[in-house]
């Protein structure tokens, strides 16, 4: 049941608008997307929320909302406002949220905003604002959130921001700002989030972020920075930093030494060639570090004090060795990707007890010693492809109970140790041309996918006999002769629906996969028989 007051409230609901009580004896009025060209006239004085967004309102008269002293949220987004006159919001003493985004404003409506002392959130995004008058926010002492993104600003309106000491979040993204001067945000000591992405910023004053003592999130992504933003050094509370998609070529020594609270750093899509060895020290909250293609890095980084790293990717560099103590610095590491480097010798990773995935493909590794991967009880995936591994200690994999994927393809192996590998589901040995011996399927009861150097080695996994069984399955119900079957196997007849030979063979392979418990490649076929061509030993 509604109280007598709510009946009175609903009688003040403009035509076609949707109105409902807000639970505090005040009224929420939704007049959005009604094609209105002017403000409705018969609004209840008890309105607390008014949504006029997505209409065709092109102008506001002075004092168009008289007596709405309880109004807390006014939405005028998505209209055709080019100008807002002085007095447009007069008397809105309780206004906390004002949404003016997606209009055609060319400058911040200074006079209209004066004395909105309760205003906490102001959206001016997606307009055509190119000018922010110096005193435009001077009366907005309670403002917490300010959106100025997707406008036409070419510089930071530093004077206008001086009065916003309570501001907590601001976005200036998607503008045309090219430089951030020293002390640009000098009075914004409460600011927690600052978005500057998608501008044209090419230079930063060395003290441009001074004063932002509460800042936790800084987004400089998609700009034109060609130097590392050393100005971040005063941001001692910074937790999330983005400067990806810029033109930064190097990250200096001790780059983040002033930002010990960093949890996330996004810096991909920069042409980074060099990284100071101490750049990522003393970041105890950092969990992930990814750096691809920094070709001038020759030494593994010193990660002292960054002990909670869980994922480290450092690919495409020129690292030739790892410190023996690498795992002492990184006891919580779960993923290690050092592919495409010049590693020759490996330390023992056994202190990295939490490692689940190691990728060392495309290096220069020549030997796997007994202690290299000892006791990595959580290791599930190990990629050692495209190295020069000729020697693997017989017990190198003997204490890896969780290992299910092992890739040793394109190495120089002539033998392969099976101890400890009974849990494998994926094994790749292709490209080891000296590895000619057969591997027994009995040693790999869980195997689902195996890639061998030679087709005949797949016969040990039942591929050959199954091929015939499958063929017979295909032929059940038709009158094909065994001779036809052999023609099919040899791919010597035209498949139905005029599919070409290649398509047919692909289908053949897919059906094999479906019916085999083990998918082995290269699978034996007419051009890859189950025979070892080198010594003529016939299996089939």
């Amino acid at each position: 049941g509604s109280s007598p007051r709510s009946g009175v409230l609903l009688r003040g609901c403009p035509t076609h608008c949707h109105c409902e009580p807000d639970g505090r004896m005040l009224l929420r009025v939704d007049c959005s997307d009604l094609g209105l060209s002017e403000l409705p006239s018969n609004l209840s004085v008890f309105t607390s929320y008014l949504d006029l967004s997505m209409n065709n309102i092109s102008q506001l008269l002075p004092n168009p909302l008289p007596s709405l002293r309880f109004l807390e949220e006014l939405r005028l987004a998505g209209n055709a406002l080019t100008y807002i006159p002085k007095g447009a919001f007069t008397g809105l003493y309780s206004l906390k949220v004002l949404m003016l985004q997606n209009n055609q404003l060319r400058h911040v409506p200074t006079e209209a905003l004066q004395n909105l002392r309760s205003l906490q959130s102001l959206r001016l995004d997606a307009n055509h604002i190119s000018y922010v008058p110096p005193s435009c926010f001077s009366g907005l002492h309670s403002l917490r959130h300010l959106w100025l993104d997707d406008n036409a600003l070419t510089e930071i309106p530093v004077q206008a921001f001086r009065s916003l000491s309570a501001l907590q979040a601001m976005t200036l993204a998607l503008n045309k700002i090219h430089h951030i001067p020293d002390y640009a945000f000098g009075n914004l000591s409460s600011l927690v989030v600052l978005h500057l992405h998608n501008n044209r910023i090419h230079s930063l004053g060395k003290k441009c972020f001074d004063g932002l003592h509460s800042l936790e999130t800084l987004d400089l992504n998609y700009n034109n920075l060609d130097e590392f933003p050393t100005a971040i050094r005063t941001l001692s509370n910074l937790k999330e930093l983005g400067f990806h998609s810029n033109n930064i070529r190097s990250i200096p020594e001790k780059a983040f030494v002033g930002n010990p609270s960093l949890i996330t750093i996004h810096f991909y899509d920069n042409p980074i060639q060099f990284v100071g060895r101490s750049a990522f020290q003393h970041l105890p909250e950092l969990r992930t570090l990814t750096l691809n293609g920094a070709s001038q890095i020759t030494e593994f980084p010193d990660l002292t004090g960054t002990a909670n790293l869980e994922s480290l990717t450092l690919t495409g560099a020129q690292i030739s060795s790892l410190p023996q103590t690498v795992c002492n610095q990184l006891p919580n590491l779960q993923v290690l990707d050092l592919s495409y480097n010049l590693l020759e010798d490996l330390p023992s990773f056994s202190v990295c007890q939490k490692l689940q995935k190691i990728d060392l493909r495309h290096n220069e590794i020549y030997e796997i010693k007994v202690d290299t991967f000892q006791q990595l009880l959580s290791l599930r995936s190990l990629n050692l492809a495209w190295n020069k591994i000729a020697i693997i200690h017989p017990n190198a994999f003997s204490t890896l109970p969780s290992l299910i994927k092992l890739d040793l393809s394109s190495n120089l192996l002539s033998s392969f140790p099976i101890t400890g590998l009974h849990g494998l589901t994926h094994l790749k040995l292709t490209g080891n041309h000296a590895l000619q011996s057969l591997i027994s399927s009995e040693n790999f009861p869980e195997l689902k996918v195996i890639e061998m150097p030679y087709a005949y080695q797949c016969c040990a996994f039942g591929v050959c006999e199954n091929a015939y069984k499958i063929s017979n399955q295909w032929n059940k119900g038709d009158n094909s002769s065994m001779d036809d079957l052999h023609k099919k196997d040899a791919g010597m007849f035209q498949a139905q629906d005029e599919r070409d030979l290649e398509d047919f063979l692909l289908d053949f392979e897919e059906d094999l996969k479906a019916l085999h418990s083990v998918q082995c490649s290269p699978s034996p076929g007419p051009f890859k028989p189950c025979e070892h061509l080198l010594d003529g030993w016939l299996i089939r």
Epitope: P134, E155, I156, P157, V158, Q159, R162, P181, D182, Y183, A184, G186, N187, K207, D210, G211, H213, T230, R233, T234, L235, S236, N237, K254, V257, G258, P260
Partner: antibody, heavy 118, light 111 residues
Framework: EVQLVQSGAEVKKPGESLRISCKGS????????IEWVRQAPGKGLEWIGE????????NYNEKFKGHVTISADKSISTAYLQWSSLKASDTAVYYC???????????WGQGTLVTVSS | DIVLTQSPASLAVSPGQRATITCRAS??????????MHWYQQKPGQPPKLLIY???NLESGVPDRFSGSGSGTDFTLTINPVEANDAATYYC?????????FGGGTKLEIK
């Protein structure tokens, strides 16, 4: 309450070395620049340089570069100004100050009098 | 370096009167809408104390008898009305450019 407490007065001979200190408290020591300013007897104020303790970044007045070294130990919230070879002209009161809004020097230490005389 | 010239070097003002100190810079200290001029008060045997930052912003706890104005190269510190304990030396300082520099000081005496 923000406080900067400087070490006591020093009397030295020309050519001697010296390090004076400035200990900060009541705020995040690593997040604000510490500046050093000198005041020769009966004279005005001269800016020597500054350090951001969180990053060891320093900026010097060219006039003093090479003659003094500014450093900090953030583990004990202390900044230092040191000389390897003092001159008589180094006689002055040396102040440390913490930066404030827009690079102003918002908080000052009580000063350290350094007297260099043979 | 930017040279700051203060005038007068000294002045004597009666309590209740207005004191005006000017500071002229050898080049503009304006940058992107901010004028990087600050004012300090120093009493004998004490460190300087920040009065006004960024030309006209009163530091917390400083009485509003103190005010600052100016832009570019010409700046003014005004004390109105002057009180007896305002006797001190006043310095302007710029940090638009390193090295930051101070004016020579203006000594205010109370009649």
């Amino acid at each position: 309450e923000v406080q900067l407490v400087q070490s006591g007065a020093e009397v030295k001979k020309p050519g001697e070395s010296l390090r004076i200190s400035c200990k900060g408290s009541g705020y995040s020591f690593t997040a604000y620049w510490i500046e050093w300013v000198r005041q020769a007897p009966g004279k005005g104020l001269e800016w020597i340089g500054e350090i951001l303790p969180g990053s060891d970044s320093t900026n010097y007045n060219e006039k003093f570069k090479g003659h003094v070294t500014i450093s900090a130990d953030k583990s004990i919230s202390t900044a230092y100004l040191q000389w390897s070879s003092l001159k008589a002209s180094d006689t002055a009161v040396y102040y440390c100050a913490r930066s404030g809004y827009y690079g102003s020097s918002q908080y000052w230490g009580q000063g350290t009098l350094v007297t260099v005389s043979s | 370096d930017i040279v700051l010239t203060q005038s007068p070097a000294s002045l004597a003002v009666s309590p209740g009167q207005r004191a005006t100190i000017t500071c002229r810079a050898s080049e503009s200290v304006d940058s992107y809408g901010n004028s990087f001029m600050h004012w300090y008060q120093q009493k004998p045997g004490q460190p300087p104390k920040l009065l006004i930052y960024l030309t006209s912003n009163l530091e917390s706890g400083v009485p509003d008898r103190f005010s600052g104005s100016g832009s570019g190269t010409d700046f003014t510190l005004t004390i109105n009305p002057v009180e007896a304990n305002d006797a001190a030396t006043y310095y302007c300082q710029q940090n638009a450019e390193d090295p930051r520099t101070f004016g020579g000081g203006t000594k205010l005496e109370i009649k």
